[in-house]
């Protein structure tokens, strides 16, 4: 088959604009704004959290995935495109699943907050496939993943009676396994065609570090966004802050330790700085002392650096994920760690209290986690199979990780 880039001129605008028109119609018929006049100070405070989440998604995750030498433009812009589409669909879906019997979906700032977090799931997953798919395929991925996550949250909530925070904190594990299973289905890059493209370059690497910094700054907002009371939010913010602070120190020290000459790896640092935030996500509001959050940050940082050292080779061979795309396996490990921490805290405390319900509680938590992984893998495989259909005009394997396939550059500079 030809190695010239396949044009998405017919496919993308038709598919994306038809979808946007459908969303506009759905919003027209089924949604309305919350009519009450709220306290303006409260409104501003509530919007602030939503703003933090949007910054995390658009700038944080957008730039974090932009470290490829010849794929940085696409990483940032495609992320924004997916976020914009994902938020719209997530608002509708969540409304349909949770409040539709009443007739119309009421949109509040909380709806937008929830939708942004759902869309963030796609931005985590897509790290495993960016550079190997075009925008038309990413639209499919957004729709399937947001739908799968929404239904997972509803099922978990109804079966296990978990609150918004707890069922959303499965996002790390869900997004990671979803992304990895989609990557497994896609054609692997040609070894001779992409060896220079999936390398990181200095300027994109710097922007990836900028993304990591934004995520680091706003991670406490993410972990506390869906909690119900000020006391829960306060604990979540403090514990997340301590955990990410320690994971930064651990990441940089551990990266130096892992290198024979004691040098620090940019790739390790990009992901490991976030390790603590992911690891304490599920239990951030439950941790009673700073030292415990700090220990978890330390463990998470070490696991992240260890994973970044030993897992990329395996992921590259089996899934075709480039060495610098480490979010998938990083989040899968750390998300699991977070869930295990939650179960361990539960066990330790219930044993201390002599509560006979311990086995049942642990069983429920394991059930939730297993369900999240199973739904992620199944929906990820379904998405991967869908993305392999010819109609999407997927880029040829030789054209993977290449901005030139998608962007108009007036003058092409060498080493762009």
């Amino acid at each position: 088959s030809s190695k010239y880039p396949r044009s998405v001129r017919r496919c993308l605008p038709l598919w994306a604009l038809t979808l946007e028109a459908a969303l506009i119609l759905l919003f027209y018929f089924f949604t309305h704004y919350d009519a009450s006049l709220e306290d303006q100070k409260g409104l501003v405070a509530s919007y602030q959290v939503g703003q933090d989440l949007t910054v995390m998604a658009a700038i944080g995750l957008g730039f974090l995935t932009s470290s490829f030498r010849r794929h940085s433009w696409s990483s940032v812009a495609f992320n924004l495109f997916m976020l914009a589409l994902g938020v719209q669909w997530a608002i509708l879906l969540d409304g349909f699943l949770s409040q539709f019997p009443s007739g119309k979906v009421v949109i509040t700032l909380f709806s937008i907050r929830l939708a942004t977090m759902s869309a963030l799931s796609v931005l985590i997953s897509v790290d495993a496939v960016l550079g190997k798919v075009n925008l038309a395929q990413l639209v499919v991925m957004v729709l399937v993943e947001v739908t799968a996550l929404g239904n997972l949250r509803m099922v978990i909530s109804n079966i296990f009676n978990t609150d918004y925070h707890m069922n959303m904190m499965h996002i790390y594990v869900f997004a990671a396994y979803f992304g990895l299973s989609v990557a497994w289905c896609l054609p692997k890059p040609l070894p001779e065609g992409t060896e220079d493209k999936d390398q990181t370059a200095t300027i994109p690497s710097l922007s990836a570090m900028l993304g990591a910094l934004f995520l680091w700054m706003f991670w406490p907002s993410f972990n506390s966004a869906l909690l119900r009371s000020p006391i829960e939010r306060k604990n979540a913010v403090f514990n997340t802050y301590y955990a990410v602070a320690v994971s930064v120190v651990t990441a940089i020290s551990g990266s130096s330790l892992a290198h024979p000459q004691g040098k620090i790896s940019k790739t390790y640092v990009h992901s490991a700085v976030l390790a603590g935030g992911v690891a304490v996500g599920t239990s951030c509001h439950l941790i009673p002392s700073p030292w415990l959050a700090m220990v978890l940050g330390l463990v998470a940082g070490l696991i992240s650096v260890g994973g970044a050292k030993y897992l990329p080779g395996c992921c590259n061979r089996v899934l075709g994920i480039p060495h610098s795309s480490i979010m998938g396996y990083n989040f899968s490990l750390l998300g699991l760690l977070g869930e295990i921490i939650y179960i361990v805290l539960l066990v330790l405390d219930t044993v201390g209290a002599g509560n006979g319900m311990i086995g049942f509680q642990v069983l429920l938590s394991i059930g939730e986690l297993s369900l999240a992984i199973v739904i992620a893998l199944m929906s990820g495989l379904l998405t991967g199979l869908l993305l392999n259909l010819k109609i999407w005009k997927a880029p040829h394997e030789a054209k993977y990780f290449d901005d030139q396939v998608f962007w108009k550059f007036p003058h092409l500079a060498v080493g762009f």
Partner: antibody
């Protein structure tokens, strides 16, 4: 002391609207979620709606969804319930109640428990033609 | 929708005796359950939250137990002021709903 005082009740015709208010004092209103609960004459308690401490989230009982709107003004320490399209079955004493979120500290983790710990005396709404 | 069923509807007990009130949920509510006491012409009063924790100022004779779907409120030695209507109430996380039981009237035998 901690106090909730409801007002705005009265007799109203079916299909009309009414707005209830609940003035809070003696505690930091903006740190607590708030509920409306009603009790029809000679009947049990029925939860109506809840609003989170910052107003970001609201939930309603199925029987009032789409007709009632809960809101709050933290600067005025006041909770509201806007009742539209009133029906005869909405006749009840309406109570506002504070949403208590208590943190109980275990050895290794915190536990959060919920309840309605402070109640007003109630305001009567009668829907009749 | 979770339905809370209280039994018995009316319980007649002599002062000084032990009273046991039951509340059953149609599906598991974990420990998201509270008990309230309401006297005629008054607002309800929170007695127990988290299925078993006594609210501030509630005497030790009141105790709650249970988890999942079966809950019990026990009053160890009834005082004259304890004769009232008792309601259990569950808190469901998603969609957020609070459901009260139909109430148990505790009367003097």
């Amino acid at each position: 002391q901690v106090q909730l005082v409801e007002s705005g009740g009265g007799v109203v015709q079916p299909g009309r609207s009414l707005r209830l208010s609940c003035a809070a004092s003696g505690f930091t209103f903006s740190s607590y979620g708030m509920h409306w609960v009603r009790q029809a004459p000679g009947k049990g308690l029925e939860w109506v709606a809840v609003i989170w401490y910052d107003g970001s989230n609201k939930y309603y009982a199925d029987s009032v969804k789409g007709r009632f709107t809960i809101s709050r003004d933290n600067s005025k320490n006041t909770l509201y319930l806007q009742m539209n399209s009133l029906r005869a079955e909405d006749t009840a004493v309406y109570y506002c109640a504070r949403d208590m979120v208590t943190m109980v500290r275990g050895a290794y983790r915190n536990y959060y428990y919920y309840g309605m710990d402070v109640w007003g005396k109630g305001t009567t709404v009668t829907v009749s033609s | 929708e979770i339905v809370m069923t209280q039994s018995p509807a009316t319980l007649s007990v002599s002062p000084g005796e032990r009273a046991t009130l039951s509340c059953r949920a149609s599906q598991s509510v974990s420990s998201n359950l509270a008990w309230y006491q309401q006297k005629p012409g008054q607002a309800p009063r929170l007695l127990i939250y988290g299925a078993s924790t006594r609210a501030t100022g509630i005497p030790a004779r009141f105790s709650g137990s249970g988890s999942g779907t079966e809950f019990t409120l026990t009053i160890s030695s009834l005082q004259s002021e304890d004769f009232a209507v008792y309601y259990c109430q569950q808190y469901n996380n998603w969609p957020t709903l609070y459901t009260f039981g139909q109430g148990t009237k505790l009367e003097i035998k």
